[in-house]
């Protein structure tokens, strides 16, 4: 707080608000009998521009000119020292410094919709730091001038509030826009322009699709303008995609065909208009319209796969597979797929409709030639159906890929290569890769992957469904007409070490040796495929190193035999497994003493 | 913003002195700097004098020596004692004040009374 100047004065010139680069002149003077007791010559007065001295002077005054002052406020106090006494405040000066107006740029001028009102922008340039009033003028025809005023730090921006209207679209109009504050003033360039140059038309508005037949090859787009338009630009796309398509239209009059548009697709819409081919600016583009196109009838087959199981010597079970067509083959929403199933030779047919499956698994007769066709359905009509003959895929032994073999590659990929068969490698019309979780009961609920892959490819990446840590059944067929061959290998797309070992459920005696039994690693606990089980013996109570038999591991089986024990010794027994890797922690163990006599 | 009320002037002859008053209400920003203006007709306005919140003057070189600016910040108020007046000082007279608003400053005006100097 600096005391009201009781002992003495400070003036400034030329004023406190001055301009960035000038100079001001700061004059501390005491009033009279104020100075230090007995000699004025001891009077010394200082002043400090905030806490730095600046300067000083013995006697009543002290006149400094100050230069170089930064933008915004500098304070400056004037002090008197007296010796052998503290410094007493005189009097304090705030300087503030500021810019003059620079000259507006970019003066532009619209007026939103015929009915709408003349409103102008510009640029104010470096910011001033004051006050600075901004006045715009219009002038028109016939010695027309309207005039608005701003009176705040940061305008740029003002709107006349008049209308321009059509009568004489030609004339010429200027607007000027002068900015002054307490430093100086600049007047920006005159602007000329017409009614057709501001005018920029409201957005359309009131838009609506129509699609005679319920077609979408007969679409035509509806909207409302304002009335001087002649010109519009149409943009549309697919909800889902980024990209416009654009199209440019001239006296339009409210409405435009649309010829390209895709089947059961959400579209956006929207709509621009503009006064005049050349002069002037495009209005706004109207609010969205969002419409759903009608459907056509399905494109493209679908990709049919099946797996056949022998029941009984007089049955088996077809298992149908097939894939969801693309959403631009739909079409439209899939209500059904029609499955057909027919005995060639006798020309038996049945036909089933199945919802909210792409799978359908039913029982035929061992004998026969059959044959199955499967479309999709949506409420426009049909796909072409896939036609497909029930073979032995693997009967033809000469088709057989050879040295199939499943690589991880990656995350959750594996790549599975293989060899032509060796019978005429030309004879393969398309491989068949298929993949399916392994699971060791053989359990036909698992869903079934595959994918097609051209004669001369041999490889193939798979990656749909595939997830870590699961060992997956992969068969490789190559087809031929009404032939096929097939191999199959396991293959995992990372993997570890297995979490647990087999659980011994039961060793029993045989002639001499023992057959051991185990239940399966749960799947989950497997990490991997398995790639062998080990089977460790010793005798109980010996610090000896533990026996062991290797078995490659098969899905089926769940016992080995062992026939090195000794008689009437007993033994600990456990079990791991194995897979590329490494080794499981132990599985229980069990102990066991061979009754029989010794060879 | 701040509103400013301006008082005092009217009909002096040559010679004679006036007190001009101003108050300032309205907005709690702290008021930097208050100032006379004065404009003749047919003229620009010009700076008669200013007072800054710390007490500090400035004058234009036609009024030194007669005019005194003085303020009270406490309520806002600033006075010019016009002493000495001539012919040539006859003009609306206008207060202003320059508030801090962040790093700027805004200015207000009053509306103007008339000063009328009499030979």
């Known amino acids: 707080k600096i005391d009201a100047c009781k002992r003495g004065d400070v003036t400034v010139k030329p004023s406190h608000v001055i301009l960035l680069g000038s100079t001001v002149n700061i004059t501390c003077s005491l009033k009279p009998r104020q100075g230090c007791f007995h000699y004025s010559r001891r009077n010394k007065l200082i002043l400090y521009k905030f806490d730095r001295r600046i300067n000083f002077h013995h006697g009543h005054s002290l006149n400094s000119q100050v230069t170089g002052l930064p933008l915004g406020t500098t304070l400056f106090v004037c002090k008197l020292a007296c010796i052998n006494s503290d410094e007493i405040q005189i009097c304090g000066a705030e300087i503030f410094v500021g810019v003059a107006p620079e000259q507006p740029q970019n003066l532009s001028c619209i007026q939103k919709g015929e009915q709408g009102t003349v409103a102008c922008t510009w640029e104010r340039g470096r910011d001033t730091h004051l006050y600075t009033e901004y006045t715009l003028q219009l002038s028109g025809p016939k010695n027309l001038t309207w005039q608005k005023q701003c009176k705040d730090i940061y305008c740029d921006y003002l709107d006349f509030g008049i209308n321009l209207t059509p009568e004489s679209p030609e004339s010429n109009f200027t607007a000027k826009v002068t900015a002054v504050n307490s430093l100086g003033s600049s007047s920006s360039l005159p602007s000329t322009f017409t009614f057709l140059d501001i005018v920029r038309p409201l957005p359309p508005w009131d838009i609506r699709i129509k699609f005679q037949k319920a077609s979408v090859s007969r679409c035509t787009l509806y909207w409302r303008d304002e009335g001087l338009v002649l010109l519009n630009r149409l943009r549309y796309r697919p909800s889902n995609s980024r990209l416009w398509n654009m199209v440019n239209v001239t006296k339009a009059k409210g409405r435009h065909d649309l010829l390209d548009l895709k089947p059961f697709t959400e579209y956006e819409f929207q709509i621009s208009s503009k006064l005049h081919l050349y002069k002037g600016s495009w209005s706004d583009w109207s609010e969205s319209l969002r419409a759903q196109t009608p459907e056509e009838e399905p494109t493209g087959m679908l990709d049919v796969w099946y797996m056949k199981r022998h029941i009984d010597y007089s049955r088996q079970q077809i298992s149908l597979f097939w894939k969801n067509l693309s959403v631009s083959e739909a079409r439209g929403k899939i209500l059904h797929y029609q499955v057909t199933l027919q005995e060639l030779t006798g020309g038996k047919a049945m036909t089933q409709n199945i919802t909210g499956h792409t799978s359908w698994t039913t029982v035929i007769p061992r004998t026969g030639n059959w044959a199955v066709a499967v479309s999709a359905a949506n409420s426009k009509g049909s796909s072409l159906p896939t036609r497909i003959n029930i073979m032995n895929l693997c009967e033809a032994g000469l088709l057989a890929p050879r040295q199939v073999s499943a690589n991880s590659e990656g995350m959750d990929n594996i790549l599975v290569t293989w060899q032509p068969p060796r019978k005429d490698p030309s004879a393969v019309q398309e491989y068949v890769v298929e993949w399916r979780e392994l699971h060791p009961g053989g359990d036909t609920q698992v869903p079934l992957n595959w994918l097609r892959s051209r004669p001369y490819n041999v490889s193939a990446l798979i990656s749909e469904n595939i997830k870590s840590y699961i060992c997956y059944e992969i068969r490789v067929y190559a087809l031929s007409g009404d032939q096929g061959g097939c191999s199959s290998i396991l293959g995992n797309s990372k993997h570890k070490a297995p979490l647990s070992g087999p659980h011994i459920n039961a060793i029993t005696e045989e002639k001499g040796s023992i057959l051991i039994s185990w239940n399966s690693i749960p799947v989950q606990e497997q990490m991997g495929c398995l790639l062998h089980y080990r089977i460790y013996w010793k005798e109980r109570d010996s610090n000896s190193q533990p026996q062991l038999c290797e078995i490659p591991y098969r899905v089926s089986q769940n016992s080995h035999p062992i026939n090195s024990l000794q008689p009437r010794v007993t033994y600990v027994l456990w079990m791991t497994a194995l897979t590329a890797a490494g080794e499981s922690s132990h599985g229980n163990e069990r102990e066991f003493c061979l009754q029989g006599k010794a060879n | 913003q701040v509103q400013l009320q301006e008082s005092g002037g009217g009909l002096v002859q040559a010679g004679g002195s006036l007190v001009l008053s101003c108050a300032a209400s309205?907005?709690?920003?702290?008021?930097?700097?208050m100032s006379w203006y004065r404009q003749a007709p047919g003229k620009q306005r010009e700076l008669v004098a200013e007072?800054?919140?710390?007490?500090?003057?400035t004058y234009a070189d036609s009024v030194e020596g007669r005019f005194t600016i003085s303020r009270d910040n406490a309520k806002d108020i600033v006075d010019l004692q016009m002493n000495s007046l001539k012919p040539e000082d006859t003009a609306v007279y206008y207060c202003?004040?320059?508030?801090?608003?962040?790093?700027?400053?805004?200015?207000?005006w009053g509306r103007g009374t008339q000063v009328t100097v009499s030979s």
């Open positions: 202003k004040a320059d508030q801090y608003y962040g790093d700027s400053l805004r200015s207000s």
């Open positions: 007072v800054s919140r710390y007490g500090s003057t």
């Open positions: 309205g907005s709690a920003a702290l008021i930097f700097l």
